[in-house]
Amino acid sequence: WPPPGTGDVVVQAPTQVPGFLGDSVTLPCYLQVPNMEVTHVSQLTWARHGESGSMAVFHQTQGPSYSESKRLEFVAARLGAELRNASLRMFGLRVEDEGNYTCLFVTFPQGSRSVDIWLRVLAKPQNTAEVQKVQLTGEPVPMARCVSTGGRPPAQITWHSDLGGMPNTSQVPGFLSGTVTVTSLWILVPSSQVDGKNVTCKVEHESFEKPQLLTVNLTVYYPPEVSISGYDNNWYLGQNEATLTCDARSNPEPTGYNWSTTMGPLPPFAVAQGAQLLIRPVDKPINTTLICNVTNALGARQAELTVQVKEGPPSEHSGISRN
């Protein structure tokens, strides 16, 4: 607000007023009269820059008149009362209402006093974020999408992530005239390490008290990544049974585990139990390469492990699990 005048009447109003598309807004405008000053106001006038004529007038005897009577209203001026408050309410804000307005007091004996107010027409955007489910491509692809719909002015979208990635942002006109829909894609080379991680879309707009944060859980579809665990190179004859586990990471989840050897089917001492392979005690040395083949919707991958059961007394701390 401008500082009050010294010794002269001064019109007080904010330099800028925000209003929302479709809503109503009040353009505040007051005449401040210093204590010792005397003034008489006979007319209040509102005009829009660049347009001919006044849009609203409050006349001391004729009362209010409007260029669009259904959309404008003096909120405080009344016939028979001192005209000190020229505040004007505008209903059903349109994009084309944005602009500079002059609020003017016709006073005696000071003359006309006016101030300019910028009306900013805003539209609060609706924000959504969604994952773009991808497969391993070896090149950058959109992995998340953030859309701010129907904002005025356009929303600002930024991405926050530890994974790197690059934004690709575009704008198109919104459904309502003068509004803008902003779409931002978060682009990265897909990898299994990214699957299940989060990225955050941050949307900033004049109409928000604070930025909106939308979290996206990334999805990368990839075939199984397979390894076999449970063998410590320290298996001996006479030990109790041990268990090998076929560890598979995949998206979607594995649909099947198949155990075999390089020579073909499993030997009798090895019993498949889904992702696990039970190794029963043996009475002669073994040197066998085991294969775990894991299947999901995207394909099959396998891991190999050469297992040796050696002669010699088993130590207290051998790698075999004892029952």
């Epitope: 008489h40 006979s42 006038t45 004529g53 006349h59 016709v106 003359g111």
Partner: antibody, heavy 116, light 107 residues
């Protein structure tokens, strides 16, 4: 009904003064500023000045500054305009007019003739 | 002082004609312009205030327009009783000033 009734015609010699009255009725006198406008015969209108009855605040046209005095009597809801050091070019019809930014009600006019 | 230049200074028109009188201010006066009608032997009568708003009781054949420096008074369909002189006035700043008048005669 708003009415502004002015005093009658005046014939004055150059150098003299004239005081024209304007008695109002039909509205609250103190709520409106009263102004004076003159019109030489067959010519345009010229604003002289105005007064706010409540405060006594005045504004004058610089052309008349020092020669014109506008006053009011709130008790009788009457405004006065006194013009001194009259000259022949001051010959005109003098109107009081109620001010609403524009002038919405006018008196019937007072002819002031300045002639030797 | 702000000069108000009216044109034409005189004109004649027939009943039913559309009549336009213009007024040009020497500087921006916003919409602080009034129009008056003065019939012979009478004081002026206010027709229009704030450039385009008609006083109650004024026939709607009278209309005003404009802002800034260029203003127009239009009589959409001239009537015999419109024989008069018409004045514009600015009340943007003191001293208030009037146009020199347009004398309208009926043919």
């Amino acid at each position: 009904e708003v009415q502004l009734v002015q005093s009658g015609s005046e014939l004055k010699k150059p150098g003299a003064s004239v005081k024209v009255s304007c008695k109002t009725s039909g509205y609250t006198f103190t709520e409106y500023t009263m102004h004076w406008v003159r019109q030489p015969h067959g010519k345009g209108l010229e604003w002289i000045g105005g007064i706010h009855p409540n405060s006594g605040g005045t504004s004058y046209n610089q052309r008349f500054k020092g020669r014109v005095t506008i006053t009011v009597d709130k008790s009788t809801s009457t405004a006065y305009m006194e013009l001194s050091s009259l000259r022949s070019e001051d010959t005109a019809v003098y109107y009081c007019a109620r001010w609403t930014g524009d002038f919405d009600y006018w008196g019937q006019g007072t002819l002031v003739t300045v002639s030797s | 002082d702000i000069q108000m230049t009216q044109s034409p200074s005189a004109m004649s028109a027939s009943v039913g004609d559309r009549v336009t009188i213009t007024c040009k201010a020497s500087q921006n006066v916003g919409t602080n312009v009034a129009w008056y009608q003065q019939k012979p032997g009478q004081p002026p009568k206010a027709l229009i205030y704030s450039a385009s708003y008609r006083y109650s009781g004024v026939p709607d054949r009278f209309s005003g327009s404009g802002s800034g420096t260029d203003f127009t008074l239009t009589i959409s369909s001239l009537q015999a009783e419109d024989l008069a002189e018409y004045f514009c006035q600015q009340y943007e700043s003191y001293p208030y000033t009037f146009g020199q008048g347009t004398k309208l005669e009926i043919k």
